[in-house]
């Protein structure tokens, strides 16, 4: 999925939270050097997803996917690509 | 780099009011079941998390956005 290419660690953390997978959340948080209080905070968010069940996780995942693939984001990605191409061309 | 629309969604989830967050979600997915779910999750997070927790969650997000993996 294109959205994960823009900031893979964000989507790793988001889907670990939303899926209720504490182990994957811990691993993802290690990758960004999260402190213990930061881990505790993220696990409180995770608890909300777990308590509200599978449908809740699916629906919120759908929202995140929809936002990430919206014209607001895809337009941004295209614009960034254009800017990168301009810079690369100028750099030659 | 993270898309600003995603960043806004996450920021409102943590720091906005339930109405502000649901309004933001509605711009992208206006299904009643989705909006009800968004409100339930937002209310849960507000009930569970102290202001300090929210600051810590925002700190994690900052680490994510500035990570080489983003």
């Amino acid at each position: 999925v294109k959205m994960a290419e823009t900031c893979p660690i964000f989507y790793d953390v988001f889907f670990a939270v939303a899926n209720g997978n504490e182990l994957l959340l811990d691993l993802s948080l290690t990758k960004v050097n999260a402190t213990e209080p930061e881990r505790t905070a993220m696990k409180k968010i995770q608890d909300c997803y777990v308590e509200n069940g599978l449908i809740s996780r699916v629906l919120d995942g759908l929202v995140m996917t929809t936002i990430s693939s919206s014209k607001d984001c895809m337009g941004e990605a295209v614009q960034n690509t254009v800017e990168d191409l301009k810079l690369n061309t100028l750099g030659r | 780099e993270i898309c600003p629309a995603v960043k806004r969604d996450v920021d409102l989830f943590l720091t906005g009011t339930p109405d502000e967050y649901v309004e933001q979600v509605a711009q992208y997915k206006a299904l009643p079941v989705v909006l009800e779910n968004a409100r339930i999750l937002k209310n849960c997070v507000d009930a569970k998390m102290t202001e300090e927790d929210k600051e810590n969650a925002l700190s994690v997000l900052d680490k994510i956005y500035t990570s080489p993996l983003c």
Epitope: G20, N21, E22, L23, L24, L25, D26, L27, L29, T30, K31, E36, K43, V50 | P68, L69
Partner: antibody
């Protein structure tokens, strides 16, 4: 001082079952993910499984998936690895290890030997 | 699954020598790599985490470097107690895998 003490190893026939335990002390057990790593005689290290601290999310190596189960009792500071449908290639020393941040095995037990043979 | 390779598989060096071991991943793992020492008949011991961070209590003669797919572990001045097998391990994602190990002994 952090201590991890494995038990439950022994000789078992192919197809048989065994339950390994790991008693932990010297740290806040529920705050840490934990793992099992095994080492076949004369061979290298192989990660087997990890479990998260509070809710017990687990991941397994493909080689043991569907045959091993990993659980923890935070009230007893104890881990359990249930081994079933055992094969000769499961013969190894099984180490339990503390997994800091679910990523670094920073403390290890002394290991318990599991031998699968007829 | 990510494969880890190590070289050499074994080496002999004199006390005081600088010893270097390399570890290679078959895909980019950023700096998500640890190094362990296992002395004969003992459990492994964490030396280096996140490619270059020295674990608390580990002598400063041990160091690690690298990022992406290529990593290096160095003992700046080999001591008799460093006789052991050294393993790298990635934590990019599950399943975690270890390198096959490098056996170090004294000439």
């Amino acid at each position: 001082e952090v201590e991890l003490l494995e038990s439950g190893g022994g000789l078992v026939q192919p197809g048989g079952s065994l339950r390994l335990s790991c008693a932990a002390s010297g740290f806040t057990f529920s705050s840490y993910a934990m793992s099992w790593v095994r080492q076949a005689p004369g061979k290298g290290l192989e990660w087997v499984s990890s479990i998260s601290g509070r809710v017990g999310s687990t991941h397994f190596a493909d080689s043991v998936k569907g045959r091993f189960t990993f659980s923890r009792d935070n009230s007893k500071n104890t881990l359990y690895l249930q081994l079933s449908s055992l094969r000769a290639e499961d013969t190894a020393v099984y180490y339990c290890a503390r997994s800091r941040g679910a990523a670094y095995f920073d403390y290890w037990g002394q290991g318990t030997l599991v031998t699968v043979s007829s | 699954d990510i494969q880890m390779t190590q070289s050499p598989s074994s080496l002999s060096a004199s006390v005081g020598d600088r010893v270097t071991i390399t570890c290679q991943a078959n895909q980019d793992i950023s700096n998500f790599l640890n190094w362990y020492q296992q002395r004969p008949g003992k459990a492994p011991n964490l030396l280096i985490y996140a490619a270059s961070n020295l674990e608390t209590g580990v002598p400063s003669r041990f160091s690690g470097s690298g990022s992406g797919t290529d990593f290096t572990f160095t003992i700046s001045s080999l001591q008799p107690e460093d006789i052991a097998t050294y393993y790298c391990q990635h934590y990019d994602n599950f399943p975690f895998t270890f390198g096959p190990g490098t056996k170090v002994d004294i000439k």
